[in-house]
Interface confidence: medium
Amino acid sequence: QLPPGKPEIFKCRSPNKETFTCWWRPGTDGGLPTNYSLTYHREGETLMHECPDYITGGPNSCHFGKQYTSMWRTYVMMVNATNQMGSSFSDELYVDVTYIVQPDPPLELTVEVKQPEDRKPYLWMKWSPPTLIDLKTGWFTLLYEIRLKPEKAAEWETHFAGQQTEFKILSLHPGQKYLVQVRCKPDHGYWSAWSPATFIQIPSDFIMND
């Protein structure tokens, strides 16, 4: 029977800069029941606080609700593992909420084949930003990436859409059924998961772009 091994805070993520969650990996348990606690202070302050919510983020997590989340301050946090034989501490982790944002996937993806009479046909797609993100505040710039592939193909073709919530693609294989998805990321932060997908059938008479 030994003191617990050293835990590690391995990930912190925020969906929208208003709340965030951190997760840790326990070290070895030393063969005894082990209790974990996360403590933190804001950089420049000495007052230590305990994690406000160990439940919302699931096992081995700490969730910071709106009232505990401050965009303009760096959080310094560590996890303490304790059993009957002793304690061990994780390394300190410095967290700036601005840099840990991972949004939900974009919403409402729809795809259409457009065949204007006077121009080459194209694939047109549109989507909406995730609902948790308020773009009107100016706190966020969301960037989008599209991926598509013929249904049976292994490789995805990706297109960067910038800040647009619609996009056109001209070079497609006639007669193929394509699978299309979109994801987003803030200017500082992580890519979201890919959105739910949309299948689109490209007509056999679709004229390839020169």
Epitope: E108, T110, W127, S128, T131, P196, F199
Partner: antibody, heavy 122, light 107 residues
Framework: QVTLKESGPVLVKPTQTLSLTCTVS??????????VSWIRQPPGKALEWLAH???????SYSTSLKSRLTISKDTSKRQVVLTMTNMDPVDTATYYC??????????????WGQGTLVTVSS | DIQMTQSPSSLSASVGDRVTITCRAS??????LNWYQQKPGKAPKLLLY???SLQSGVPSRFSGSGSGTDFTLTISSLQPEDFASYYC?????????FGQGTKVEIK
Amino acid sequence: QVTLKESGPVLVKPTQTLSLTCTVSGFSLSDAGMGVSWIRQPPGKALEWLAHIFSNDGKSYSTSLKSRLTISKDTSKRQVVLTMTNMDPVDTATYYCARIRTGTYSLYLDYWGQGTLVTVSS
Amino acid sequence: DIQMTQSPSSLSASVGDRVTITCRASQSINSYLNWYQQKPGKAPKLLLYFASSLQSGVPSRFSGSGSGTDFTLTISSLQPEDFASYYCQESYSTPWTFGQGTKVEIK
């Protein structure tokens, strides 16, 4: 509270065009992450998804029926309209509209209308 | 399009039984799988969404599990009001598809 109500003809002749209206209350058709779907169910058979329209006006259709379907919405009237051309007796079914809810990693139909039975017969 | 295969197509059970219905997708749908209950002459009612999230107001005897291609709806202790048809539906890819349904009947 949220309600949806389908309206339209109960009897349609073969080759005619069916127009169904879904009138909603308790939410707005322009609310982000909301939409309306149409689903049908022939007597004694399974549910079949037909089309949907999202708050951003994006539309999607059943692959097999795409050439016959058009979905549109009038946000101010709180209505979604589905038209289906060239009706056939096999299109006899109860037609439902339902609210689409999109959220964090979820996409589902949380409120349904009571349905309207459409019979196609000469 | 993605195909959804439900099994069994019907089953007979008694009040208090544990009932399991499975749904298989023809390709991975992550966890974008919803379950609905439908009683004769009524509209379907949402039970679970995103494979395992219980819709508000639905009794806790209903639970869901699975991800990728294989999903399960479980009724832990069947009640008289649970005799109905159950449908799975994928919302991972448009066009959306429903399973063919499972009718739960009284033994």
